[in-house]
């Protein structure tokens, strides 16, 4: 089942999926003056069994301006450096991609992919938040989201984190713990 | 089911001292934010502040800092505001509610009365 | 600090109106506001968030759109169960404000 919404947006903070749940789509976006090849696949779609996940189809973008495909191939340096996706880059990995059954990785990037990534969630996808620069979590806890079905209907949990300004003062006791931790997170709740 | 479960209704006079509380059941106490929110008479809401007992961090209105003090302990699923000093003004009905930025859960309020 | 700023303050209506509450921040807030509704001795229960996202278990005639400095909820078709007064609130990461509220009343 997919999730009718985009995970939550909160103040000062962006969020990333660290795995996939099979089911998950990712939109074969290009970048501006690329498209899709004809007969391209749509999206690439997280499939798998129960000892191994990956995703299928391949995304391929190709020149407005000829006819020729594109290999598939991974992007130089400094394609990479321009590329961002909807959700942020970080070197924050509160979970093993590897080591979660049932889930797909980050998929490597395409040749003349699309700055920013549109991923279709499924129910039970997680994903998880950090401040953006220049803001720091007001407490030590999981921050996260997680897509549910309650009543019938997909809804992601509200996000735990409040990100505060370096300059604001707050009645925070003690250091700072990275806020995206895997454990004590909060657990599943009754849906109806 | 998601619970919070505040304390009975108060009646104390100016100067007293006062505690309330909410009490979490039906999920992870520890993990969520509780927040207090003051309705006095026939009037709206107001948002006072703020509390995670993971850590116990907290936030303030600043309407009302340094009026009350919110706290909480975890180890009893229980989050508390309190008065050191009450006024005829702090006559309201109050509410604790899981956060932090909109309310999905609400305790079911504590009538606090101060008069002389 | 934001205000928001709610009218009508009371809305005289008929079972099976069609209703629209207005929030108006007076500054920009995004998509950052929540509808609840309070009925007379009871706790507030939230509506929607992020301006138009329906709360779980309630009622689709209950609708919110907008974005920046106005808001609406909109109730499709007035039930008697929704006489009540509705509160829009915003909500950032240094604080929370509430309007002063629209009691939906019957005409």
């Known amino acids: 089942e997919l999730c009718d919404d985009d995970p939550p947006e909160i103040p000062h903070a962006t969020f990333k999926a660290m795995a996939y749940k099979e089911g998950t789509m990712l939109n074969c976006e290009c970048k501006r003056g690329f498209r899709r090849i004809k007969s391209g696949s749509l999206y690439m779609l997280c499939t798998g069994n129960s000892s191994h996940s990956s995703w299928d189809n391949q995304c391929q973008c190709t020149s407005s301006a000829t006819r020729n495909t594109t290999k598939q191939v991974t992007p130089q340096p400094e394609e990479q450096k321009e590329r961002k996706t909807t959700e942020m880059q970080s070197p924050m990995q509160p979970v093993d991609q590897a080591s979660l059954p049932g889930h797909c990785r980050e998929p490597p990037p395409w040749e003349n992919e699309a700055t920013e990534r549109i991923y279709h969630f499924v129910v039970g996808q997680m994903v998880y938040y950090q401040c953006v620069q220049g803001y720091r979590a007001l407490h030590r806890g999981p921050a996260e989201s997680v897509c549910k079905m309650t009543h019938g209907k997909t809804r992601w949990t509200q996000p735990q984190l409040i990100c505060t300004g370096e300059m604001e003062t707050s009645q925070f006791p003690g250091e700072e713990k990275p806020q995206a931790s895997p454990e004590g997170r909060p657990e599943s709740e009754t849906s109806c | 089911q998601v619970q919070l479960v505040q304390s009975g209704a108060e009646v104390k006079k100016p100067g007293e001292s006062l505690k309330i509380s909410c009490k979490g059941s039906?999920?992870?106490?520890?993990?969520?934010?509780i927040a207090w929110v003051r309705q006095m008479p026939g009037k709206g809401l107001e948002w006072m502040g703020i509390?995670?007992?993971?850590?116990?961090?907290?936030r303030y209105s600043p309407s009302f800092q340094g009026q009350v003090t919110i706290s909480a302990d975890k180890s009893i699923n229980t989050a508390y505001l309190q008065w050191s000093s009450l006024r005829a003004s702090d006559t309201a009905m109050y509410y604790c509610?899981?956060?932090?930025?909109?309310?999905?859960?609400w305790g079911q309020g504590t009538l606090v009365t101060v008069s002389s | 600090d934001i205000v928001m700023t709610q009218s009508p303050s009371t809305l005289s209506a008929s079972v099976g109106d069609r209703v629209t509450l207005t929030c108006r921040a007076s500054?920009?807030?995004?998509?950052?506001l929540a509808w609840y509704q309070q009925k007379p001795g009871k706790a507030p229960k939230l509506l929607i968030y992020?301006?138009?996202t329906l709360e779980s278990g309630v009622p689709s005639r209950f609708s919110g759109s907008g974005s920046g400095t106005e808001f609406t909820l909109t109730i499709s078709s007035l039930q008697p169960d929704d006489f009540a007064t509705y509160y829009c609130?915003?909500?950032?990461?240094?604080?929370?404000?509430f309007g002063g509220g629209t009691k939906v009343e019957i005409k």
């Open positions: 992020k301006a138009s």
């Open positions: 039906g999920y992870s106490f520890s993990n969520y934010w």
């Open positions: 509390i995670y007992p993971g850590d116990s961090a907290t």
């Open positions: 500054q920009s807030i995004s998509s950052y």
């Open positions: 509610a899981r956060g932090p930025y909109y309310f999905e859960y």
């Open positions: 609130q915003h909500y950032n990461s240094y604080s929370v404000t």
